[in-house]
Interface confidence: medium
């Protein structure tokens, strides 16, 4: 018979033969014949292989290195590659997730928009008229100025956006 | 031969300060995270502080935050601990360790051999 | 702040199988690893990464990390195995020892 020029999935052609690819969490180790199937083997510790391949070699897992910030997010397998993500308070410089800065935090003025995950930075936005900011912050968001009419109290000092107003007593009439 | 040699242990009192050093060799000291372990006497391991290779980041534990500042010279191939403000509960063997790093995964290969501080009046 | 449990002690006779656990919270998606300690002696790493054996450790020590709970397994224990023994973990940037368990070999 005519010797194939393609072959099935999960498949490879070599010396114009079909053989079977390894599956994932094996690494070839021979190639079929015309005898034996296709011979492979499981990947070794801290290895793996994630598709259906022909490779001789399996690949090291990623390494989390906790004193750049990394920690596992979730292990390893024969089949699957280590997953890091960042410590709580950093986030990722990178979708691969390679190393991890600080949070920003949010100036006095600003407040916090949208806190920080292990994948994104803090967004900070600037505190509205009404709303302030007083600290620098990677959590607080901006606080509404206080309301002295509520308290029964009048505007001794106007708020900024850095500062809340500061009420005082209302200088009443004497009869 | 790779091997951590600790110094700079005694006797000190409440209140006062001490700098322990740890002299690395046979390895790439510059490679390599590095960190304090305590052991008190009779009590187990507690970890004290980590420094990454570059010397960038450094990790303490709560118990001594504030007081001990770690730091290492990667020209000399040495890791040091500054203690002050000590306490008696300071009292302990201070071990240098080597963190594994790719190779040993999150564990420490190397230990020296320990230096003993004793904190009383 | 994260917390390691281990047993203080652990007693068996020589040639069984001694095995010596270490909980913590959600300790399975962590990498644990072991140091055996005899008095008068610095700690030496016996396992890392779960259950991997640096070089120069005998074939006998084993372990396992799933769930909530680390495993070092020895089998066939010998009296040169009596030791203290501590499980370790980083957690959030911080480096957490278990209690330690004295392994007596009767």
């Known amino acids: 018979p005519e010797p194939p020029t393609a072959c099935r999935e999960k498949q490879y052609l070599i010396n114009s033969q079909c053989c079977s690819l390894c599956q994932p969490g094996q690494k070839l180790v021979s190639d079929c014949t015309e005898f034996t199937e296709t011979e492979c083997l499981p990947c070794g510790e801290s290895e793996f292989l994630d598709t259906w391949n022909r490779e001789t070699h399996c690949h090291q897992h990623k390494y989390c290195d906790p004193n750049l910030g990394l920690r596992v997010q979730q292990k390893g397998t024969s089949e699957t590659d280590t997953i890091c993500t960042c410590e709580e308070g950093w986030h990722c410089t990178s979708e691969a997730c390679e190393s991890c800065v600080l949070h920003r935090s949010c100036s006095p003025g600003f407040g916090v928009k949208q806190i920080a995950t292990g994948v994104s930075d803090t967004i900070c936005e600037p505190c509205p008229v009404g709303f302030f900011s007083n600290v620098s912050s990677a959590f607080e968001k901006c606080h509404p100025w206080t309301s002295c009419e509520t308290k029964d109290l009048v505007v001794q000092q106007a708020g900024t956006n850095k500062t809340d107003v500061v009420c005082g007593p209302q200088d009443r009439l004497r009869a | 031969e790779v091997q951590l040699v600790e110094s700079g242990g005694g006797l000190v009192q409440p209140g006062g300060s001490l700098r322990l050093s740890c002299a690395a060799s046979?390895?790439?000291?510059?490679?390599?995270?590095m960190s304090w372990v305590r052991q008190a006497p009779g009590k187990g391991l507690e970890w004290v502080s980590t420094?990454?290779?570059?010397?960038?980041?450094?990790y303490y534990a709560d118990s001594v935050k504030g007081r001990f500042t770690i730091s290492r010279d990667n020209s000399k191939n040495t890791l040091y601990l500054q203690m002050n403000s000590l306490r008696a509960e300071d009292t302990a063997v201070y071990y240098c360790?080597?963190?594994?790093?790719?190779?040993?995964?999150?564990?420490?290969?190397?230990w020296g051999q320990g230096t003993t501080v004793t904190v009383s009046s | 702040s994260y917390e390691l449990t281990q047993p203080p002690s652990v007693s068996v006779s020589p040639g069984q199988t001694a095995s010596i656990t270490c909980s913590g919270d959600k300790l399975g998606d962590k990498y644990a690893a072991w140091y055996q300690q005899k008095p008068g002696q610095s700690p030496v790493l016996v396992i890392y990464?779960?259950?991997r054996r640096p070089s120069g450790i005998p074939e006998r020590f084993s372990g396992s990390n799933s769930g909530n709970t680390a495993t070092l397994t020895i089998s066939g224990t010998q009296a040169m195995d009596e030791a203290d023994y501590y499980c370790?973990?980083?957690?959030?940037?911080?480096?957490?020892f278990g209690g330690g368990t004295k392994l007596t070999v009767l």
């Open positions: 360790a080597k963190e594994g790093g790719k190779y040993y995964y999150y564990a420490m290969d190397v």
């Open positions: 370790q973990a980083w957690a959030s940037s911080t480096v957490v």
């Open positions: 046979g390895f790439t000291f510059s490679s390599y995270a």
């Open positions: 420094i990454n290779a570059a010397g960038g980041g450094t």
């Open positions: 990464q779960d259950s």
